[in-house]
């Protein structure tokens, strides 16, 4: 169902797996990292060379596009049904142009439905990319250029590029614009984690990771 | 409500700096950031450059790089513009304004009142 | 740097006239531009950014468009009081720029 039942079965090496949708035998092809902190992550998210356009529709971020293993979006019905039936925790890597990395962890996340507009719940931040919160909280709605839920007339998806919960348009876009190395600074609509490397500051990569709260 | 209040008049001699602060209240500092701009008698509005007032980070304007310093004290939640080696055309209104810096949102509302700066010998 | 070409540099009109003052970005701008409006002794007041979104509290008689490189700012039914100077601004990218200005004379 998850990576964290993959792991659980045996299958302890990094790569792509098959995973199943809660209460159905629709499949969806997940990266699955089998060796950070004690394996079993479910990759949601990734960003690492700009291979992929990540400006895309709301039905393209409701099923999932790119590639598992270089850059993708898993799906948000996926994760809004993995994440509605256990309770999760989300890890968010992030790396910068000059070799430093850094984390954070949300002790507690799950999407709602769709006809919620895959709204963001998170609780309990810790890790080194930030004291705050770049995840507006409470969570807000997500956003893409064909659905416009971010609590601003701006249309913060367009400006900004990419779907994310915007919040008019808040501190992060971790599906924003990405610029290679110095072309990195002063990109108002690049990968964005504010309260770790502040504004303008596009990133070098992402990864968004969940395994439940259990494991 | 937010509001930034500026230092008062100055009147320097060419060669000599000033230093304008800018203090803020009504809101969150460290989410946002301050743009310093001018405009010399009857022209237009010149930006000088912008400051976080998160972390401090700062980008000027290619024609004061080296001349012009932005910091803020988080502490008293103001901003401070220091312009160097002062010129009688450096005579000038400098304003400092607010921008949400935290949503890569670079409009500037509101604005401070003005800092009159006279650069005569 | 991105340069923003104003025109007219100044109008005068009449009580309820349409006034349109039009903005040229010199690479595109998506909508990141914002219009502000200065009277003589104040500071400049935001009236629009996002290229069209209104601030909050300036009337409905201004409104604002465009993308890309072209932008305008009109004032449907002038009043008294919107006499002025006008200034767009890029927020693309630093350094950021102003248009150089649109004096609103009230005739």
């Known amino acids: 169902r998850d990576c964290a039942e993959v792991f659980k079965s045996g299958h302890t090496t990094n790569g792509i797996y098959t995973l199943t949708f809660p209460n159905s035998t629709e499949e969806i092809k997940a990266y699955c990292d089998m060796e950070a902190g004690g394996g079993g992550w479910t990759i949601i998210q990734r960003r690492e060379d700009g291979s992929v356009d990540f400006q895309r529709t709301w039905k393209e971020y409701k099923v999932g596009f790119g590639n598992p293993s270089g850059e993708y979006w898993l799906g948000n019905e996926f994760v809004s049904q993995l994440t509605n039936q256990q309770r999760y925790v989300l890890k968010i890597h992030l790396k910068d142009w000059e070799g430093n990395e850094a984390y954070s962890l949300y002790e507690h996340f799950y999407l709602s439905s769709e006809e919620l507009n895959y709204r963001i719940h998170l609780k309990g931040l810790t890790g080194t990319a930030g004291k705050i919160s770049s995840i507006s909280q409470p969570g807000n709605d997500f956003s893409t250029k064909d659905g416009d839920n971010d609590n601003c007339i701006c249309k913060c998806s367009q400006m900004l590029t990419g779907g994310w919960w915007f919040d008019a348009c808040g501190p992060s876009n971790l599906n924003g614009m990405y610029y290679p190395q110095r072309q990195n600074t002063n990109k108002f609509n690049g990968i964005k984690w504010y309260y770790w490397k502040g504004s303008g500051y596009s990133l070098k990569a992402t990864t968004m990771m969940i395994r439940p709260a259990d494991f | 409500q937010v509001q930034l209040v500026q230092s008062g008049v100055e009147v320097k001699k060419p060669g000599a700096s000033v230093k304008v602060s800018c203090k803020t209240s009504g809101y969150t500092f460290s989410n946002n950031g301050f743009s310093w701009v001018r405009q010399a008698p009857g022209q237009g509005l010149e930006w000088l450059g912008w400051?976080?007032?998160?972390?401090?980070?700062?980008n000027y304007a290619q024609k004061f790089q080296g001349r012009v310093t932005m910091t803020t004290d988080t502490s008293t939640s103001t901003a401070y513009m220091e312009l160097r080696t002062l010129r009688s055309d450096d005579t000038a209104v400098y304003y400092c304004?607010?921008?949400?810096?935290?949503?890569?949102?670079?409009?500037?509302?509101?604005w401070g009142q003005g800092t009159l700066v006279t650069v005569a010998s | 740097d991105i340069q923003m070409t104003q025109s007219p540099s100044s109008v005068s009109a009449s009580v309820g006239d349409r006034v349109i003052i039009t903005c040229r970005a010199s690479q595109g701008l998506s909508s990141w531009l914002a219009w502000y409006q200065q009277k003589p002794g104040t500071a400049p007041k935001l009236l629009i950014h996002s290229a069209s979104s209104l601030q909050t509290g300036v009337p409905s008689r201004f409104s604002g468009s465009g993308s890309g490189t072209e932008f305008a700012l009109t004032i449907n039914s002038l009043q008294p009081e919107d006499f002025g100077t006008y200034y767009c601004q890029q927020a693309n990218s630093f350094p950021l720029t102003f248009g150089g200005g649109t004096r609103v004379e009230i005739k």
């Open positions: 304004a607010r921008d949400q810096d935290y949503s890569n949102f670079h409009w500037l509302d509101p």
């Open positions: 400051i976080s007032g998160y972390n401090g980070n700062t």
